[in-house]
């Protein structure tokens, strides 16, 4: 897989899994995003898959999921320390990955197609400089 | 062979309500999440419901959200779209189609296999 | 009121080439590109391609696709008689949380 496509796909995927509320998004899941500023890509990759893995025990999965799952775990390191207290529900663990990913792609140079929902996520977060 | 077999369509009065099915073969069923989709006469294809492959969760089109039911039995490879309160407008060829699993170079957005259609006909 | 915009018709003599545009918004075709279908009247619709050019097995690379921006094209080189169908493009948008189809593209084969 190519990095840059991988992240791609992992963007569109979590722009459908957000755009669409069920009775899922109010799961309780994992905050992994609380780690220290050091953490690597692959760690975070890794906590986020196992967070995505949990929820398949709780009859939540969708073809957005798995291939989420699937990509994030591409990318990851095979295992990872879990010990996070706080907690999340899905939607938010899912937006708060999008945020993550859109930056990992404009990091490396790619706004084609993607520079419309920039705008729009600054838009939406009061900021308004260029990347 | 993947095939989709559907059934169900039939002449239905306005407020009255129809079970669609959809037999599903040459494929894992419990593996893929399905739709409904429909095309009423002189309009285009328009997409109506999702069920994930465990059965759960679902989604709907708005024009059909609190009306119809999807719904699925793992254990008899079947996919089932219960209508109710139908209207004139519902009138159309209704479709099942399998989703597209998320492969690379296909993220999953499309319908790879779809059903024969049944009519569906609301009409006093 | 189709999300995605057609032609309602296109028309090319056999051996020649035609192309069906679909046009959509930011919140659909701009990030997710779109997939093609084939529909021959009273049959099911069959996947065509993705609008980045993947083709499924058995679809002939007479057929292929491109995107730019809020819009893509369907492509039909060598036309043939069984080319006659209806086509429709279809994408996600995530303003309605939903899959939306195109408003379908007649193509008629001439002479």
């Known amino acids: 897989h190519n990095f840059n496509i991988t992240i791609k796909e992992i963007i569109k995927m979590l722009n459908i899994l957000t755009a669409r509320n069920d009775s899922c998004m109010e799961l309780t899941v994992k905050d992994v995003f609380t780690a220290p500023k050091n953490t690597s890509d692959k760690e975070i990759f890794c906590r986020a898959a196992t967070v995505l893995r949990q929820i398949y025990t709780h009859n939540c999965s969708n073809r957005y999921l798995r291939g989420l799952y699937r990509n994030l775990s591409s990318m990851a390191n095979k295992t990872c320390s879990m010990n996070e207290i706080k907690k999340s529900t899905l939607k938010d663990f899912l937006e708060r990955l999008k945020v993550i990913m859109q930056k990992k792609y404009y990091r490396h140079g790619l706004n084609d197609i993607f520079e419309a929902q920039k705008i729009e996520w600054h838009e939406h977060h009061h900021h308004h400089h260029h990347h | 062979e993947v095939q989709l077999v559907q059934s169900g369509g039939d002449l239905v009065k306005p407020g009255g309500s129809l079970r669609l099915s959809c037999v599903a073969s040459g494929f894992a069923f419990n593996g893929y999440d399905m739709d409904w989709v429909r095309l009423a006469p002189g309009k285009g294809l328009q997409w109506l419901s999702e069920i994930s492959s465990s059965g759960s969760p679902t989604y709907y089109a708005d024009a059909v959200e609190g009306r119809f039911t999807i719904s699925r039995d793992n254990a008899k490879n079947t996919l089932y779209l219960q209508m109710d309160s139908l209207r004139a407008e519902d009138t159309a060829v209704y479709y099942c189609?399998?989703?597209?699993?998320?492969?690379?170079?296909?993220?999953?957005?499309?319908?790879?296999?779809w059903g024969q259609g049944t009519l569906v006909t609301v009409s006093s | 009121q189709s999300m995605l915009t057609q032609p309602a018709s296109v028309s090319g003599s056999l051996g020649q080439r035609v192309a069906i545009s679909c046009s959509g918004s930011t919140n659909n075709i701009g990030i997710f590109g779109a997939t093609w279908y084939q529909h021959l009247p009273g049959k099911a619709p069959k996947f065509l391609l993705y609008?980045?050019?993947n083709r499924p097995s058995g679809v002939p690379d007479r057929f292929s696709g491109s995107d730019s921006g809020n819009s893509v094209t369907l492509m039909i080189t060598a036309l043939q008689a069984e080319d006659e169908a209806d086509y429709y493009c279809q994408s996600f948008d995530t303003t309605l949380g939903a899959y939306v189809f195109g408003s379908g593209t007649q193509l008629t084969i001439l002479g």
């Open positions: 609008s980045d050019g």
């Open positions: 189609a399998r989703a597209g699993e998320y492969t690379y170079g296909y993220e999953g957005y499309y319908f790879d296999y």
